[in-house]
Interface confidence: medium
């Protein structure tokens, strides 16, 4: 047969759950200390909340049937009568009550024809405010009349054919009434709910709802343009010509900010958004749903995309309707004739309106940017000039900040990027262009992206005219080549000489995409003395060795994940992993991650990798000549550095020979 | 070093008019929000008004709204106070004050006043 | 318009010994998107301009030493010194830039004893 509604598929679920109890009985979910009362769909039976407010379960007869006497569960089917008879049944009586005070109403209902009628529970009339009850039965009853005649349509319609953002055409001239069928089941009329459905009469079907509804006269604009409250919200409509849309055919939401909402944003940020007409437009889109979305609809958290673009959380607590967990709506369900307005007060500022302070600050990234603003970069995170500022995590400063110097400055301005960006769109070995002039790489691996040593750490934040990135560390632009590292620091003076003995200078000079994890002089000074002639003993050999300290591709630490196996320039796989923060390679730990060179990245290590395919031979002790070389430039090397190189015995005499 | 050098003292008759100047050094002066504060005798500060790095939006405090226009000229890197309907409460020493950056609204750098006197 | 509030209005203090001042506005300053408080504090020395000494209610300004400091949330705001100077002397004033028309306090007037 056809698809099943919400609707259907929530009845018959609440009578599966019902079933044990017998035939056609509904588990029904009371909110605790109300009277409402909900059919129970799966989720809300296993999290017997409703509105985060706890839940009792009944268990009643479902609609159409009735209970017999000694018999199990509610085996009869309702016996049919007119529609005047039906309000009784279903429990409004107050509808039959007013029903025979219009005298005309009654011999309808009573008499043939076919109609719907919306039903008002009793305490839904209850509910009305006195004056609007006197006004209803004031003036010979007509406006009763009327009222009741508007909760009516000229022909049977039951809820398979209630459909979401329908239109029905009621009994008091014609007007629209407006019916939203959701997903979770759950129908509106006017934004009042259906209690009980399709009961049947020889002359109809009568639904239960929880409120007495009225015409609906007004589209959204003309409310806007009505109510005080909304005098800014008026403004800003204006200058943002969205007011045709509103004014217009649609079913929308609009969480409409009150002036109050508008006065609790700092004037700057205020004057800055209403100065700006591409921000003002996302700032009011993003107070606009693309459907209608009565306040009786929400039982639970629902994500809900503005027309900006932006995913609101909508949910509730209790009877106060929450957006992104907070209570901010204070008038919910004013019914336009192409939509529905809950008042709200405060602003949704989405982050497409933002400047890249604004978008910082709620990010976890405060302590970056008050290094950026006392290096005095803040005209740039609050200006119109397309950005992406590239801003390190607090958890990053743990240990404190750097002084402000002209370093400082500078390393700070090439974590700004000349464009906006946004990370989707980044790619392997895409270059980007610092403030500070550098050239910064882009890094793709299976579980992260990063730029040069920095890895994103959370969603991008796109503003207004600048982007976030969150960054899992500080960025060190490259400044030199991996021979250019090397040669910089003391700590690899052996390592160096090992290289050019080795004829691998060039390689590491040239352009390229390499991986070095660099043995310090203690790696070399630990090796055995078998090991070390085994390495010194032969340039052929040497360059193997050293080549099985290269990856052929560039790996930050940010993109090991748990284990990457790196192929080698000697050819053997290099297994590089990451566990508690600490890289490792063939399960040796890494002494210090990540320096960036133009042509690759430096690990440093305390020790020599030996390839698996390579191990040690026996050997003597003798020092080839080819290797002498090595020591006496690292040797002199380090003494230039005043750092002395302390050699085994045996080398140290060779070297005092050497001097001779 | 940031500098801001501002015209001299000036005697004035009540409902008359005066324009007070400010020029600035040291800085990109299109890139800042200006600012005008003022202080009576032996009182306390008083902001006066705004007005926005490109010059588009000036804001006044209500005492001054309607007599005082405050501008700027970023070719000469000045900004201007303008007042006028000059009344005795005027006086005051009127500071010019550079904001932080291009939005925040704390008055980062001061100018050394001008006072100005508004006598019968 | 909000109103800034500061007490005392005098506060005479011994050289070496801390200072403490307070502020109170009368609405919260604290802007709940970016949980900054829009408040800062200026020093007028006697013949002098203002100049600024902590901003975000308590960020110091680059130059100003770090005796001073600033602290609070939403309306009440403190301003310690914590080895008073006789370089300190003058009139503390806090302000608000978290709304139009932006206000001072009516300054509290540090002298030593």
């Known amino acids: 047969g056809p698809a099943k509604s919400p609707y259907q598929l929530v009845l018959q679920h609440s009578r599966l759950r019902g079933r044990q109890h017998g035939p056609n009985v509904c588990a029904v979910q009371k909110v605790i200390g109300t009277n409402r009362k909900y059919f129970t769909n799966c989720k809300q039976w296993y999290q017997r909340k409703i509105c985060g407010k706890s839940t009792v379960i009944s268990y009643e007869c479902c609609p159409g049937y009735e209970k017999v006497p000694g018999e199990k569960g509610c085996p009869a089917a309702l016996p049919l009568s007119n529609l005047y008879e039906t309000l009784g049944v279903v429990g409004s009586t107050t509808t039959q009550l007013y029903t025979d005070r219009t005298e005309k109403l009654r011999p309808e209902m009573e008499g043939p024809g076919s109609f719907t009628i919306f039903a008002p529970s009793n305490e839904a009339w209850a509910s009305l405010p006195a004056e609007v009850l006197d006004s209803l039965v004031s003036n010979v009853n007509i406006e009763l009349l009327n009222a009741l005649r508007y909760h009516m349509v000229g022909r049977r319609v039951l809820t398979d054919e209630l459909k979401h953002g329908m239109t029905l055409t009621s009994m008091y001239q014609n007007s629209n009434i407006q019916i939203h069928h959701y997903p979770n089941g759950i129908v509106t009329v006017n934004c009042a709910r259906l209690l009980k459905a399709d009961h049947h009469a020889t002359n109809g079907v009568v639904h239960l709802i929880d409120k007495v509804i009225s015409t609906i006269t007004n589209n959204i604009q003309q409310i806007i343009e009505i109510e005080d409250t909304f005098e800014t919200l008026r403004a800003a409509v204006a200058a943002s010509g969205l007011n045709t849309m509103l004014e217009g055919n649609g079913q929308y939401t609009l969480l409409a900010p009150t002036n109050e909402a508008f006065e609790k944003i700092p004037s700057e940020t205020l004057n800055r958004i209403l100065g700006d007409p591409e921000a003002l437009r996302d700032l009011l889109n993003n107070h606009i749903l693309k459907s209608a979305m009565c306040a009786e609809a929400i039982v639970a958290g629902l994500s809900v995309e503005t027309l900006e673009g932006t995913t609101l959380e909508v949910g509730c607590s209790g009877d106060m309707l929450t957006i992104n967990g907070k209570a901010i709506i204070s008038n919910k369900d004013i019914l336009a004739t192409n939509g529905v307005i809950h008042y709200i007060d405060e602003l949704l500022i989405p982050d497409s309106a933002k400047t890249l302070f604004e978008l910082a600050a709620e990010s976890d990234v405060s302590t970056a940017i008050d290094l950026f603003r006392q290096a005095g970069l803040g005209n740039h995170l609050s200006g119109s000039e397309r950005l992406t500022l590239l801003a390190p995590l607090n958890s990053v400063f743990k240990d404190g900040t750097p002084p402000i110097d002209a370093h400082t400055r500078n390393l700070l301005r090439n974590h700004i990027i000349k464009d906006q960006l946004a990370s989707k769109y980044l790619y392997h070995g895409q270059t980007l262009e610092t403030l500070g002039g550098k050239k910064l790489r882009v890094f793709v691996y299976r579980n992260s992206l990063c730029i040069e040593n920095s890895c994103i750490a959370a969603h991008d934040k796109r503003g207004r005219y600048g982007t976030l990135f969150t960054m899992d560390r500080v960025l060190t632009p490259p400044m030199g080549t991996v021979m250019d590292v090397l040669k910089g620091d003391n700590r690899f003076s052996m390592l160096v000489a090992a290289i050019q003995s080795a004829g691998l200078t060039e390689t590491l000079n040239r352009e390229g995409v390499y991986t070095v994890f660099a043995p310090t002089n203690e790696a070399f000074r630990a090796l055995p003395p078998r090991e070390r002639s085994r390495l010194l003993g032969d340039a052929k050999e040497l360059a193997n060795i050293l080549k099985y300290h290269i990856g052929d591709e560039i790996l930050v630490s940010g993109g090991i994940g748990a284990l990457v196996r790196l192929k080698s320039l000697q050819g053997d796989k290099l297994e590089v992993s990451l566990k508690n923060n600490v890289v490792s390679v063939n399960k040796e730990p890494v002494a210090e991650p990540d320096i960036m060179a133009t042509n690759g990245v430096v690990h440093v290590i305390t020790n020599v990798l030996q390839p698996p395919a390579n191990r040690p031979q026996e050997r003597g002790d003798e020092l080839a000549d080819s290797a002498l070389e090595i020591f006496k430039q690292a040797s002199a090397f380090s003494r230039a550095s005043q750092r002395s190189v302390r050699l085994a015995p045996v080398y140290q005499k060779l070297l005092e020979r050497m001097k001779h | 070093q940031v500098q801001l050098v501002q015209s001299g003292a000036e005697v004035k008759k009540p409902g008359s008019s005066v324009k007070v100047s400010c020029k600035a050094s040291?800085?990109?002066?299109?890139?800042?929000?200006m600012y005008w504060v003022r202080q009576a005798p032996g009182q306390g500060l008083e902001w006066v008004g705004t007005?926005?790095?490109?010059?588009?939006?000036?804001y006044y405090a209500q005492k001054v709204q309607g007599r005082f226009t405050i501008t700027r000229d970023s070719s000469t890197s000045t900004l201007y106070l303008e007042l006028s309907s000059l009344r005795s409460e005027d006086t005051a020493v009127y500071y010019c004050?550079?904001?932080?950056?291009?939005?925040?609204?704390?008055?980062?750098?001061w100018g050394q006043g001008t006072t100005v006197t508004v006598s019968s | 318009d909000i109103v800034m509030t500061q007490s005392p209005l005098s506060l005479p203090v011994t050289p070496g010994e801390p200072a403490s001042m307070s502020c109170r506005s009368s609405q919260s300053l604290l802007y709940s998107s970016n949980q900054k408080n829009y408040l800062a504090w200026y020093l007028q020395k006697p013949g002098q301009s203002p100049q600024l000494l902590i901003y975000?209610?308590?960020t110091r300004e680059s130059g100003v030493p770090d005796r001073f400091s600033g602290s609070g949330s939403g309306t009440d705001f403190t301003l310690k010194i914590s080895r008073v100077e006789a370089e300190d002397v003058g009139v503390y004033y806090c302000q608000q830039y978290y709304r139009y028309p932006y206000t001072f306090g009516q300054g509290t007037k540090l002298e030593i004893k």
């Open positions: 007005i926005s790095d490109g010059g588009i939006y000036a």
């Open positions: 004050v550079r904001g932080w950056d291009r939005y925040d609204s704390w008055f980062a750098c």
């Open positions: 975000w209610g308590s």
């Open positions: 040291g800085f990109t002066f299109s890139d800042y929000y």
